[in-house]
Interface confidence: medium
């Protein structure tokens, strides 16, 4: 019995659902009562899901698997794996037995996009040409391990004095911290790129350092120039710092975080103590770091509605404030492609190709091209609908007149994450008889 599975690994984003395709060719007169279907982990032989004695025997794998019962009789033995985790990565074997027996293994490759890197500088003030500075590039919650690259403002790769560490959290996702030590010239731009080798997703950030003396007078409050990019559901740190003078104590500090536009209070520290979150109980300061001038705010379980500008007010004797922008993002799923009509196609027929990608933010850019890489812009209609959480589902429809055959590719780009997700369909028109 010939059992067919895809040669290439199935790539699935953490938290999404994946389909492990498996098919066989039922003979005439085949009935499900004859079918024994077993999915198991290839290495450990652990049972995942089974169908026997004419019945779906259910999931033996954390209740996260399902078959496609309506399609089994046509030879579709595919397995749906829900809410994919890093631990699911590996090989799954599909065993099919009717009269004969056959099996094949399909690989699941798990992936998660890395966040836009945040850049920090140490020391971050009173910098002069000739000073040595440490630039830290941090990117969060990606999988698998990232490749990290640095370069200067002229595009020259920087490989010396770079130390990169990658730590996996409880879910197996990696936080990447790459440290570059440089001696300052008159000024300089330093860029860090974090690349996900599976998703071919690049996330990069730059810092431009202009050595100079800090102005005196009011409290100098420092926040990142670039927006802080946070994935929906993750935690974000809105960085804010000030320079405490000798003899500074927390009793002197008034710290207020508020929404820049509406002035709504978010979090405060006054009279020597943390006054707590005034923002859905999802914010926290870093109390142990306040005395060193770290007034950063932690925002937990980020939602689309959190996007916007937050102002950090610091008052000691003098007063200073600065605003930091939060840009929320969510990766788009790999597009699914559908064809209408999808059979008995002939050259000259008009077909509608729909490219659908789900649960991303912000709105996507959608591009189409043919097999020669030529952009297709005519006869394209794209709609984007936000769900209750503010995440967008994208549906882009291309109408084409078939040639002898052709490949049509759709790319859904998340402009914030610089994440590209694409799907292709190859149509081979049947010649006229």
């Amino acid at each position: 019995l010939e059992v067919q599975v895809p040669e290439d690994p199935v790539v699935a984003l953490v938290g999404t659902d994946a389909t492990l395709c498996c098919s066989f060719s039922p003979e005439p007169g085949f009935s499900l009562a004859q079918l024994n279907l077993i999915w198991q982990l290839t290495d450990t032989k652990q049972l995942v899901h089974s169908f026997a004695e004419g019945q779906d025997q259910g999931s033996a794998y954390a209740n996260r698997t399902a078959l496609f019962p309506d399609l089994l009789a046509q030879g579709n033995a595919s397995l749906r794996l829900q809410r994919v985790r890093v631990a699911d990565e590996g090989s799954f074997t599909c065993f099919v037995s009717i009269r004969d027996f056959g099996s094949a293994a399909v690989s699941l490759q798990v992936a998660a996009p890395y966040s836009k890197p945040s850049m920090t500088l140490e020391p971050n003030k009173d910098l002069r040409p000739g000073d040595t500075v440490t630039i830290t590039c941090s990117s969060y919650q990606g999988y698998p391990e990232a490749e990290v690259f640095w370069q200067d403002g002229q595009g020259v790769p920087l490989t010396g004095n770079v130390t990169t560490s990658q730590m996996a959290n409880e879910q197996g996702l990696f936080d990447v911290h790459s440290i570059l030590r440089v001696v300052l010239g008159a000024n300089g731009t330093y860029s860090c790129l974090v690349r996900n080798p599976v998703l071919q997703q690049d996330a990069h950030s730059s810092v431009t350092i202009t050595p100079q003396r800090s102005p005196t007078g009011a409290v100098e409050v420092q926040v990142p120039e670039d927006p802080v990019v946070a994935l929906v559901g993750t935690d974000a740190t809105l960085r804010c710092s000030f320079s405490p003078e000798p003899g500074f104590s927390l009793a002197q500090l008034n710290l207020i975080w508020q929404l820049t536009d509406t002035k709504q209070l978010v979090h405060s520290f006054t009279e020597g103590r943390d006054q707590g979150s005034a923002y859905a109980n999802r914010t926290a300061l870093f109390p142990d770091l306040l005395a060193q001038g770290n007034a950063s705010l932690r925002l937990q379980r980020v939602r689309v509605a959190d996007e916007g500008s937050f102002t950090c007010f610091v008052s000691i004797r003098d007063f200073g404030s600065a605003a930091v922008s939060l840009q929320v993002a969510a990766p788009y799923s790999k597009p699914s492609m559908t064809l209408e009509p999808n059979k008995d196609l002939r050259p000259g027929d008009t077909v509608t190709i729909t490219c659908s990608s789900y649960r991303g933010y912000p709105e996507a850019e959608v591009f189409w091209q043919d097999g020669q890489g030529v952009p297709l812009t005519g006869n394209v209609t794209t709609s984007q609908m936000a769900n209750e959480q503010g995440l967008f589902d994208v549906h882009s429809v291309l109408r084409v007149v078939l040639g002898a055959n052709g490949t049509y590719s759709c790319l859904v780009r998340n402009p914030v994450l610089q994440q590209d997700a694409h799907g292709s369909v190859t149509i081979t028109g049947q010649p006229m008889t």
Epitope: E147, G153, Q154, G155, D202, H204
Partner: antibody
Framework: EVQLVQSGAEVKKPGASVKVSCKAS????????MHWVRQAPGQGLEWMGG????????TYNQKFKGRVTMTRDTSISTAYMELSRLRSEDTAVYYC??????????????WGQGTTVTVSS | DIQLTQSPSSLSASVGDRVTMTCSAS?????MHWYQQKPGKAPKLLIY???KLASGVPSRFSGSGSGTDFTLTISSLQPEDFATYYC?????????FGGGTKVEIK
């Protein structure tokens, strides 16, 4: 159409200087770093350095430091490469080449047609 | 500096042949790029980031490899493919090219 058009062939005497120009068209000149690569007769390719047209920052191959100067004139979308104290082994075809647009594209996607520089007494 | 050694330095092949050439780096690099150059012409980008096909390049060209060993393959040699091929790295400054592989008609 994206194009890099270089100045014509030059014949120079040893010890002289040569300045080769490269005019860009079909794209925004300041958005791509421009590099220079040379090729001696019957030999391979040798990287000389590059210039960021946006702010004029340069990077040079150590081998040419002190002899090569790269400049640009953004008003006419032109990059220049000047090589001084010429010697016979500098006889080569000199190419300008555009670095890929993304910051971390470390390859050259568009090349000029080349300028032949002959150094002979 | 990272040295790139291409082999063979030249090869003879016929139209339709499968042709493979290699580029070996003196230390590990992140990506390799490949160019094609015909006599009297400027080089042309063929493959970038080890395995990605440059715009307009036929799919018979492919690249692979990692670390120090990289390969350029032409699956079915065509008359217009007779040329010299160069590899290039810039994972570590300075940027360097290989010495080239010349593909000639048998």
């Amino acid at each position: 159409e994206v194009q890099l058009v270089q100045s014509g062939a030059e014949v120079k005497k040893p010890g002289a200087s040569v300045k080769v120009s490269c005019k860009a068209s079909g794209y925004t000149f300041t958005e791509y770093i421009m590099h220079w690569v040379r090729q001696a007769p019957g030999q391979g390719l040798e990287w000389m350095g590059g210039i960021n047209p946006n702010q004029g920052g340069t990077t040079y191959n150590q081998k040419f430091k002190g002899r090569v100067t790269m400049t640009r004139d953004t008003s006419i979308s032109t990059a220049y490469m000047e090589l001084s104290r010429l010697r016979s082994e500098d006889t080569a075809v000199y190419y300008c080449a555009r670095k890929g647009k993304d910051y971390f594209d470390w390859y050259f996607d568009v090349w000029g047609q080349g300028t032949t520089v002959t150094v002979s007494s | 500096d990272i040295q790139l050694t291409q082999s063979p330095s030249s090869l003879s092949a016929s139209v339709g042949d499968r042709v493979t050439m290699t580029c070996s780096a003196s230390s590990s690099v992140s990506y390799m790029h490949w160019y094609q150059q015909k006599p009297g012409k400027a080089p042309k980008l063929l493959i970038y980031d080890t395995s990605k096909l440059a715009s307009g390049v036929p799919s018979r060209f492919s690249g692979s490899g990692s670390g120090t060993d990289f390969t350029l393959t032409i699956s079915s040699l065509q008359p217009e493919d007779f040329a010299t091929y160069y590899c290039q790295q810039w994972s570590s400054a300075p940027l360097t090219f290989g010495g080239g592989t010349k593909v000639e008609i048998k």
